[in-house]
C-alpha cells in the first residue's frame, strides 16, 4: 500500500505524458487522478515507466474499477497486464478479439503465464465456444496451445476451426487429445481431393481408427516413418503387411530402424514371418510359419 | 537492422570540453526514448543520462549533473552528450543505447561506443 | 538500488555449468536483465523480466529469481560464452547495473 500523501504544488498531472517517469511512488499516487489515467491508458505503453510505477498505476485503477476494468481499459493496459494476477483478469469480460490480441502481444516472447491462461480461459467461456478466428489467434502466439486443451475441452472446438490449426500445434497433443480432434479434421477436409485431403489429415492422424488407415493404404499415399510411429498402436496392430506397404509407399524400408520400438514392434508381433518376409527389409519375430493364430478376444464374443 | 553509431570521443584535458554524437538509422527514432551508458576501463556501466522521446524529460546521474547536457534532434535521428568541465573520472567508454519499444527500460540496442580519454 | 554480483570473477571449463547470482539492495520484483560483453564490444542483452530469454539467445542461458535474489545460468559453458555478464534492474529510477562477473577459461 502507497501511503496517502498531499501532491506538491506544481506537480498535479493534467496528462499522462512523460513528465511523470521521474515521480517517486508517493508522488505518482497523489497527484495522478485515476480516473485521468483510465481514459488515457493508451499513453502508458509510450511511457518507459518502472515496474515500481507500474504497481502505483494498477494500484490507481484497482480503487477506481473494484468490480474489474471495462474492456475499453482492459485494451490499452499494454505492459501494465504483466502486472495483473489471475485473480485480478477473473474479474474482466473480455469480448473484443483485439483486446485479446493486445494483450496477448504484450506476452509476447514470455511462455503461457497464469495471467495468460486466465485470460484465454475467460474469453473462450465468454465466447461460448473456441471459433476459428480465436483460435487461429492463439495458436499464432501460443503454437501448443490447442494441446494444452483437456479432451473435455477439445470437444466444444467446431470442426470448421481446425483449418486454423498448422501441424506444428499438435507437436505436444497425445492420443487422447488426438482422439478428439482427428474426426473433427475428417470432416473438415472431407471435401477435398486424395493427396490434399492427406496433407491436411496428416498430423491428426494420431486418433485415426484401423479402418481409416485401411482406406488411406488405398490411395498411394506413402506417409513418412514420423507419422506412421505417432499413429495409435491399436489402430496399426489389424493391419496386414500387404496394408502397411501401402501405406508407406517407399517410406515401408525405414521400419527396420524401428523394429524394436512401437507400434512397429507390435505390429511385427501380429504377422506372420512369410509375409513380414516379403518385404525383404530382414524383419524378425513375427509368427513362426505353420503356427495357429487364435483371436482370444473373437473367440470370447463367439462363445 | 537498428544501428547507434557514436563519435566525438577523444583526449581532453580536465576541464575541457567534448561533445559525443550518436546516429541511428533502421528505426524510428522519433518514438524512442535514448540513454547514454559509460564504461570506465576494466569497471563496470553506469547510466550516464536518458532523453525522452520528446526530448522534453530527461535525466543525469548525480556524478555528471551540472557538467553534462543531453539533447536529440529527431529531423536527423542524432543523440547528443556535451560534456563540459571533464574529470579523470569521466574517462570512459561511452555507449549510446536504445530499448526496444516494449520493454523501455532494458537496452536492447548498443553502438560500438567512442572512447574519451580525460588527461593532462 | 544497488545490485552486487558473485562471484566477481569465475575459471569455468567448456562443457562446465555456471551460476551467476546478483543480489538487489531492496526488492525489484522481476524487474532484472542479464547482459554478456565480450573485450572491446557493447553488452548484449540475453535475459529480461529475470527469466525471458531475449529472442536469438540460446536456451543454455537462463535467468531466475524474484524481490533480492536472481540467477544466470549457463547449463553447457561453450567456448564464445567466455565473456564478462553484468545484471541491470529496472524496478525503479535510477536504472542500475551490477559490477560485473568475468567468466574466464580455467
Known amino acids: 500500500e502507497v501511503e496517502k500523501t498531499a501532491c506538491p504544488s506544481g506537480k498535479k498531472a493534467r496528462e499522462i505524458d512523460e513528465s511523470l517517469i521521474f515521480y517517486k511512488k508517493w508522488e505518482l499516487e497523489a497527484c495522478v487522478d485515476a480516473a485521468l489515467l483510465a481514459t488515457q491508458m493508451d499513453r502508458v505503453n509510450a511511457i518507459p515507466f518502472t515496474y515500481e510505477q507500474l504497481d502505483v498505476l494498477k494500484h490507481k485503477l484497482d480503487e477506481l474499477y473494484p468490480q474489474g476494468y471495462p474492456e475499453s481499459v482492459i485494451q490499452h493496459l499494454g505492459y501494465l497486464f504483466l502486472k495483473m494476477s489471475p485473480e485480478d483478469i477473473r474479474k474482466w469480460n473480455v469480448t473484443s478479439l483485439e483486446t485479446l490480441k493486445a494483450l496477448l502481444e504484450v506476452n509476447k516472447g514470455h511462455e503461457m503465464s497464469p495471467q495468460v491462461a486466465t485470460l484465454i480461459d475467460r474469453f473462450v467461456k465468454g465466447r461460448g465456444q473456441l471459433d476459428k478466428d480465436t483460435l487461429d489467434t492463439l495458436t499464432a502466439f501460443y503454437p501448443g496451445y490447442l494441446c494444452s486443451l483437456s479432451p473435455e475441452e477439445l470437444s466444444s472446438v467446431p470442426p470448421s476451426s481446425i483449418w486454423a490449426v498448422r501441424p506444428q500445434d499438435l507437436d505436444t497433443c497425445d492420443p487422447r487429445q488426438l482422439d478428439v480432434l482427428y474426426p473433427k479434421a475428417r470432416l473438415a477436409f472431407q471435401n477435398m481431393n486424395g493427396s490434399e485431403y492427406f496433407v491436411k489429415i496428416q498430423s491428426f492422424l494420431g486418433g485415426a481408427p484401423t479402418e481409416d488407415l485401411k482406406a488411406l493404404s488405398q490411395q498411394n499415399v506413402s506417409m513418412d516413418l514420423a507419422t506412421f510411429m505417432k499413429l495409435r498402436t491399436d489402430a496399426v496392430l489389424p493391419l496386414t503387411v500387404a496394408e502397411v506397404q501401402k501405406l508407406l509407399g517407399p517410406h515401408v524400408e525405414g521400419l527396420k530402424a524401428e523394429e524394436r520400438h512401437r507400434p512397429v514392434r507390435d505390429w511385427i508381433l501380429r504377422q506372420r514371418q512369410d509375409d513380414l518376409d516379403t518385404l525383404g527389409l530382414g524383419l524378425q519375430g513375427g509368427i513362426p510359419n505353420g503356427y495357429l493364430v487364435l483371436d482370444l478376444s473373437m473367440q470370447e464374443a463367439l462363445s | 537492422q537498428v544501428q547507434l553509431v557514436e563519435s566525438g570521443g577523444g583526449l581532453v584535458k580536465p576541464g575541457g570540453s567534448l561533445r559525443l554524437s550518436c546516429a541511428a538509422s533502421?528505426?524510428?527514432?522519433?518514438?524512442?526514448?535514448m540513454s547514454w551508458i559509460r564504461q570506465a576501463p576494466g569497471k563496470g556501466l553506469e547510466w550516464v543520462s536518458y532523453i525522452s522521446s520528446s526530448g522534453s524529460t530527461i535525466y543525469y546521474a548525480d556524478s555528471v549533473k551540472g557538467r553534462f547536457t543531453i539533447s536529440r534532434d529527431n529531423a536527423k535521428n542524432s543523440l547528443y552528450l556535451q560534456m563540459n568541465s571533464l574529470r579523470a573520472e569521466d574517462t570512459a567508454v561511452y555507449y549510446c543505447?536504445?530499448?526496444?519499444?516494449?520493454?523501455?527500460?532494458?537496452?536492447?540496442?548498443w553502438g560500438q561506443g567512442t572512447l574519451v580519454t580525460v588527461s593532462s | 538500488i544497488q545490485l552486487t554480483q558473485s562471484p566477481s570473477s569465475l575459471s569455468a571449463s567448456v562443457g562446465d555449468r555456471v551460476t551467476i547470482t546478483c543480489r538487489a539492495s531492496q526488492g525489484i520484483s522481476s524487474a532484472l536483465a542479464w547482459y554478456q560483453q565480450k573485450p572491446g564490444k557493447a553488452p548484449k542483452l540475453l535475459i529480461y523480466?529475470?527469466?525471458s530469454l531475449e529472442s536469438g539467445v540460446p536456451s543454455r542461458f537462463s535467468g531466475s529469481g524474484s524481490g533480492t535474489d536472481f540467477t544466470l545460468t549457463i547449463s553447457s559453458l561453450q567456448p564464445e560464452d567466455f565473456a564478462t555478464y553484468y545484471c541491470q534492474q529496472f524496478n525503479s529510477y535510477p536504472l542500475t547495473f551490477g559490477g560485473g562477473t568475468k567468466v574466464e577459461i580455467k
Open positions: 543505447a536504445s530499448p526496444y519499444k516494449k520493454r523501455r527500460t532494458v537496452f536492447d540496442y
Open positions: 533502421g528505426f524510428t527514432f522519433s518514438d524512442y526514448y
Open positions: 523480466d529475470a527469466s
